[in-house]
Interface confidence: low
């Protein structure tokens, strides 16, 4: 599930992070949701994925890889703009919808190569593939219109990820699951 490191990360890796909270360790918090999030790793100088429990934690937690890089990697946006000029659509944009096998229900977006648009789909929380974005804006920037200027910025509204347990199981199981909101 881990995102591959960008060249821009290693190019900027020796610099100090922009904010003190970028130096904090990833903190999943005490709750039990499984929300894919990102943190800045002081040791690798890269933004990396971790699974957030849905409550508490700390400020070194971002909904998207892009947001993490912008916040914690000095000069990232400048370098990213340079890298994006004439950008091509990454191969993973053409992957089929893959909800994965786990039974959490997360609202995600994927690029549909038939309609040439980013669309909503439901992700199960594990496995799956990289044609899977937390926000419509991120999907559009990477797959629909790569290198095509800035995205929504502050207009991009991050909806809280919700996981709701699947209620039906094999008939003999009694469920005592909690809903995480």
């Amino acid at each position: 599930l881990s995102e591959e490191a960008d060249d821009t990360d290693s190019e900027l890796g020796s610099m100090k992070p922009l904010h003190t909270f970028c130096a904090m360790k990833a903190d999943d918090g005490p709750c039990k949701a499984m929300i894919r999030s990102y943190f800045f790793n002081m040791y690798t100088h890269q933004c990396e994925e971790f699974i957030y429990g849905g409550c508490e934690g700390n400020e070194n937690r971002f909904d998207t890889l892009e947001e993490c890089k912008k916040t914690c990697i000095p000069g990232y946006e400048k370098t990213a703009v340079k890298a994006a000029s004439g950008a091509e659509r990454p191969d993973f944009c053409f992957l089929e919808e893959d909800p994965g096998l786990c039974r959490g229900y997360m609202k995600r977006y994927l690029y549909n190569n038939q309609t040439k648009q980013c669309e909503r789909f439901v992700y199960g929380g594990c496995l799956g593939n990289r044609n899977n974005f937390e926000t419509l804006d991120e999907c559009k920037k990477i797959c629909e219109n790569p290198g095509g200027g800035s995205g929504g910025g502050l207009n991009d509204i991050f909806e809280a990820q919700k996981i709701e347990w699947h209620e039906g199981g094999p008939p003999h199981h009694h469920h005592h699951h909690h809903h995480h909101h």
Epitope: K32, I51, P99, G100, R103, G124, G125, G168, G169, P170
Partner: antibody, heavy 120, light 113 residues
Framework: QVQLVESGGGLVQPGGSLRLSCAAS????????MSWVRQAPGKGLEWVSA????????YYADSVKGRFTISRDNSKNTLYLQMNSLRAEDTAVYYC?????????????WGQGTMVTVSS | QSVLTQPPSVSGAPGQRVTISCTGS?????????VHWYQQLPGTAPKLLIY???NRPSGVPDRFSGSKSGTSASLAITGLQAEDEADFYC????????????FGGGTKVTVLG
């Protein structure tokens, strides 16, 4: 009552092929991801492969990738594992299991297993 | 070598409390993924004992309990009984491996006397 019954195991020579089946009953088969897990004699459990409820997504452990193929026929409530280019290290009891019904990534119900022996 | 590490064996007298540890890393248990436990009685298939770190499926006695902290998890059996003699396996999910689903090596629980 939920039941999984594996069949198709047996003795096969190295390089040979075998197809395992798992007949499911007592639940809505097409609603659940299914998986194969194996256990070599005297050893621990090893995840082999998994498939989504629709059959559209499949996943494999590195040790079997390119040699094994998981599939399902939802009209027959049956899960399959096609095993090609078998090796001695594939010798194990193969279990089919329902994946992720009660909790993310747990194997809820297991079959009784079928023994596969790869030997010359 | 299993991705999740369990002690090969633990033992206890009837009525005693025994615990089995399951140690992982920051890419599996430490990343927030659930831990599940299975009991395998001699000559039988594994059975789900604890799911989602600490939940018991119906029919599992409350003598069995699970917990998770940091990069490790543990299974406790209180009031050990002769019929608890079995192999116990922990299992989780690992985001750093293409294998993804990972098991511990198993722990043999022996009931003494």
């Amino acid at each position: 009552q939920v039941q999984l019954v594996e069949s198709g195991g047996g003795l096969v020579q190295p390089g040979g092929s075998l197809r395992l089946s798992c007949a499911a009953s007592g639940f809505t088969f097409s609603s659940y991801a299914m998986s194969w897990v194996r256990q070599a004699p005297g050893k621990g459990l090893e995840w082999v492969s998994a498939i989504s409820g629709s059959g559209g997504s499949t996943y494999y452990a590195d040790s079997v990738k390119g040699r094994f193929t998981i599939s399902r026929d939802n009209s027959k409530n049956t899960l399959y594992l096609q095993m090609n280019s078998l090796r001695a290290e594939d010798t194990a009891v193969y279990y089919c299991a329902i994946l992720g019904a009660t909790s993310l990534s747990a194997f809820d119900i297991w079959g009784q297993g079928t023994m596969v022996t790869v030997s010359s | 070598q299993s991705v999740l590490t369990q002690p090969p064996s633990v033992s206890g007298a009837p009525g005693q409390r025994v615990t089995i540890s399951c140690t992982g890393s920051s890419s599996n248990i430490g990343a927030g993924y659930d831990v599940h436990w299975y009991q395998q009685l001699p000559g039988t298939a594994p059975k789900l004992l604890i799911y989602g770190n600490s939940n018991r499926p119906s029919g599992v006695p409350d003598r069995f309990s699970g917990s998770k902290s940091g990069t490790s998890a543990s299974l406790a059996i209180t009031g050990l009984q002769a019929e608890d003699e079995a192999d116990f396996y922990c299992q989780s999910y690992d985001s750093s491996l293409s294998g993804s689903v990972v098991f511990g090596g198993g722990t043999k629980v022996t009931v003494l006397g």
